[in-house]
Structures are given as C-alpha cells and as structure tokens.
C-alpha cells in the first residue's frame, strides 16, 4: 500500500519519463542559480512537501536530488539564512521502511546525517548547516532543480 506522497512522486516521475526528448539546457533560466551541472531555484514562499513536489513539476523540474555530501555542502553554501529550511526530493517510504529519493533510489546512509525521526509522513529538509526530518505537512520553502545539459538528450529517470 503506497502512501499518497509515494503515489504522487511515482506519478510525476512516470509522466516525466514519457517524454523522450527535450532541448538541452545551456544556461540557467532567470532567477535560477547554477551549481555545477544543475540549475537550482530556491522558493520564497512555503508549502507542504507534496505541494512543493508538484510546484517543481510545473516548472519542468524536480525537487532537489543530492548525490553526495559534497553536493550537499555546496548547496548549503547557497542558503543565506541559517534558520530557513528547504524541502528536497527525499521522503520516508513506509513500505520499504527507508528514505527514498523521488527518482526511486534509496538514500545511501553515509550521504546525509539526518536529524529527527525516520517514520511515516516524514520528509527531508536542509538548512545552511543541517539535514532534518520534518513532518511532510510542515510548510517550509523548497528547492527545485533542472539538469544543465549542453546537448539534446534522451530523458531517463533522474539518478
């Protein structure tokens, strides 16, 4: 039995995978910040995790996926206020009892030191200094990402 959050992220991922081609993104759009091969958009408004996920989708992007600790640190360096929290694309899968990225992969336990509980209806946020488990219904800011690719590319599930 999938939770509504799991269903929502799976639906969004499937609809993204139906697209076979899209123009490569040479530069980050206005208001987006470049971080290596990604463009990031830090929201100024707040939303629960589900709504944040949907908002990124409407922007033809996804909630932020973080590959490793190095990328986490570089992303955190872009956060100006230490007290502000941002949703990323990671939530607790009740069926698998594990943290799951919205692209379907599981969290490598060494990548992020999560503070807070790992349980149903928990989603992950980051601040300037830490990574927190929060109730998914909490209204905080969020980070969308677009991959920066210089050529036309086939679209596969994000990894």
């Amino acid at each position: 039995q999938k939770s509504s959050i799991e269903k929502c992220s799976v639906d969004i991922q499937q609809s993204r995978n139906k697209t076979t081609e899209r123009p490569g993104l040479l530069n980050c759009p206005i208001y987006w910040q470049q971080l290596r091969e990604k463009c990031l958009l830090f929201s100024h408004t707040v939303n629960p995790w589900n709504n944040s996920l949907a908002d990124c989708s409407t922007k033809e992007s996804s909630l932020l996926l973080i590959r490793d600790k190095d990328e986490l640190i570089h992303t955190q360096n872009l956060i100006r206020d230490k007290a502000i929290l941002f949703w990323i694309g990671l939530n607790f899968s009740l069926s698998e009892k594990n943290w799951k990225w919205i692209n379907g992969s599981f969290l490598n336990s060494n990548d992020l030191e999560i503070r807070g509980d790992a349980k149903e209806n928990s989603c992950i946020s980051i601040s300037q200094t830490s990574v927190y488990s929060e109730y998914c219904s909490t209204e905080i800011r969020w980070i969308c990402q677009k991959e920066l690719t210089p050529v036309r590319n086939k679209v596969y599930p994000d990894s």
Partner: antibody, heavy 119, light 107 residues
Framework: EVQLVESGGGLVQPGGSLRLSCAAS????????MHWVRQATGKGLEWVSA???????YYPGSVKGRFTISRENAKSSLYLQMNSLRAGDTAVYYC?????????????WGQGTMVTVSS | DIQMTQSPSAMSASVGDRVAITCRAS??????LAWFQQKPGKVPKRLIY???SLLSGVPSRFSGSGSGTEFTLTISSLQPEDFATYYC?????????FGQGTKVEIK
C-alpha cells in the same frame, strides 16, 4: 515507544550537589539536541541547559558555572550535574529532546523529577 | 537573549468562547515557535509547532498564526478540557525562551 525518564531528584541542603539523569529510549538519541527545563511550583517553564549532538553545551546566566550538562550516547543518557545549589533551584526538572528543526523541537518530555533545596 | 512577552497572563472565559493568546518576540524568530498546554501536575503538551502547524491528535479548534515577531494561539470554541496554562516557546536561537504563560480559567 519514544520515551524519556528522569531520575536523581531529591532533597538537598543549600550549597549541596545533585546529579540528575534522563534515560532515552525508542529513538536515535545521538541525533537529537537535549535540554533540561525546570518549573518551580506555581511558576512558569524555565530553560536550564542544552547539549548539542556534537557535545556543545549551553546555559543561562542563572546556572552557568554551577550546572554541567553531559550526555552518553552509547547509553542513550543525559545528565545534569548541579553544584552549589540554592533555594531558588527548587523545581521539577524535565528533560526534552530537540532535532534542531521544526517538527521535533521539544516534542518529547520526561515526566519530571523533583529537586528540593532546603535546610 | 530573545524575550517572549505573552499576554494576557491570565483570563477568565466560558465554554464556547473564542480565546486568543499572543506572544511577542523581542526580535525575529522566523517560524521557530511552539505552543504548549499544561494542566496542573502534568507534563507540558505541545499543540502547535512551526508557528501554525497543528500536531496530529490535537483538536482542530486550536490554531496558530503569525510570523517574525507576533504570534497568536487561538481556541475557536473553548471546551471544558481546555482550561489550562498555555506557553509559547521560541527555539530560533539560543537560549530557547518561554513566554511567562497564560492561565485560562473558567468564568
């Protein structure tokens, strides 16, 4: 079940010492900041001390130099060493957990342990 | 240190009344504010976190609002079990500070 259980309270003379303990269970103790909060009879809540996940400690001026907070992650235990106790330290002492974020800030409290400083 | 000024310190109200309790922070605390309910001889119980998020199991008659420095706890229709003392807490920065409490009594 997530639980915090305090112990170590009692009657002590002014100038004396007492060590409070807080035993945690049901959660990953090491990933939480921990706090001591006290409440004198008929009074409000007063924050007493905190210890971060890295062992960093915090105190208000009223107890600085007299109280020492510590933690033992392997035993999921929190401690408060109270020295040079005064009548004004008489209160129920609670331990509470705090993730540092929003959802789990001061969300779980122990049942409290009574400290009475009197001659 | 951030001071939390809670008002009123006490109030008398009747069952069914709408009750509002305010907490004012001496400086901005974002939404790092929680509200607690405490009954005599009992442990404080968190009702609201992140200024306006209602905890699971807490009746919907409780609501929180505000941001920055001004925060309000509202009970839309006071019930007999709501007579208690309410505290706000800021945990935006050390030291965490509580409001002095508001005792809601039966009129």
């Amino acid at each position: 079940e997530v639980q915090l259980v305090e112990s170590g309270g009692g009657l002590v003379q002014p100038g004396g010492s007492l060590r409070l303990s807080c035993a945690a269970s049901g959660f990953t103790f090491s990933s939480y900041d921990m706090h001591w909060v006290r409440q004198a009879t008929g009074k409000g809540l007063e924050w007493v001390s905190a210890i971060g996940t890295a062992g960093d400690t915090y105190y208000p001026g009223s107890v600085k130099g007299r109280f020492t907070i510590s933690r033992e992650n392997a035993k999921s235990s929190l401690y408060l060493q109270m020295n040079s106790l005064r009548a004004g330290d008489t209160a129920v002492y609670y331990c509470a957990r705090d993730s540092g974020g929003l959802s789990y800030a001061f969300d779980i409290w122990g049942q409290g342990t009574m400290v009475t400083v009197s001659s | 240190d951030i001071q939390m000024t809670q008002s009123p310190s006490a109030m008398s109200a009747s069952v069914g009344d709408r009750v509002a309790i305010t907490c004012r922070a001496s400086q901005g605390i974002n939404n790092y504010l929680a509200w607690f309910q405490q009954k005599p001889g009992k442990v404080p119980k968190r009702l609201i976190y992140a200024a306006s998020s209602l905890l699971s199991g807490v009746p919907s008659r409780f609501s929180g609002s505000g941001s920055g420095t001004e925060f309000t706890l509202t009970i839309s229709s006071l019930q007999p079990e709501d007579f208690a003392t309410y505290y706000c807490l800021q945990h935006n920065s050390y030291p965490p500070t509580f409001g002095q409490g508001t005792k809601v009594e039966i009129k």
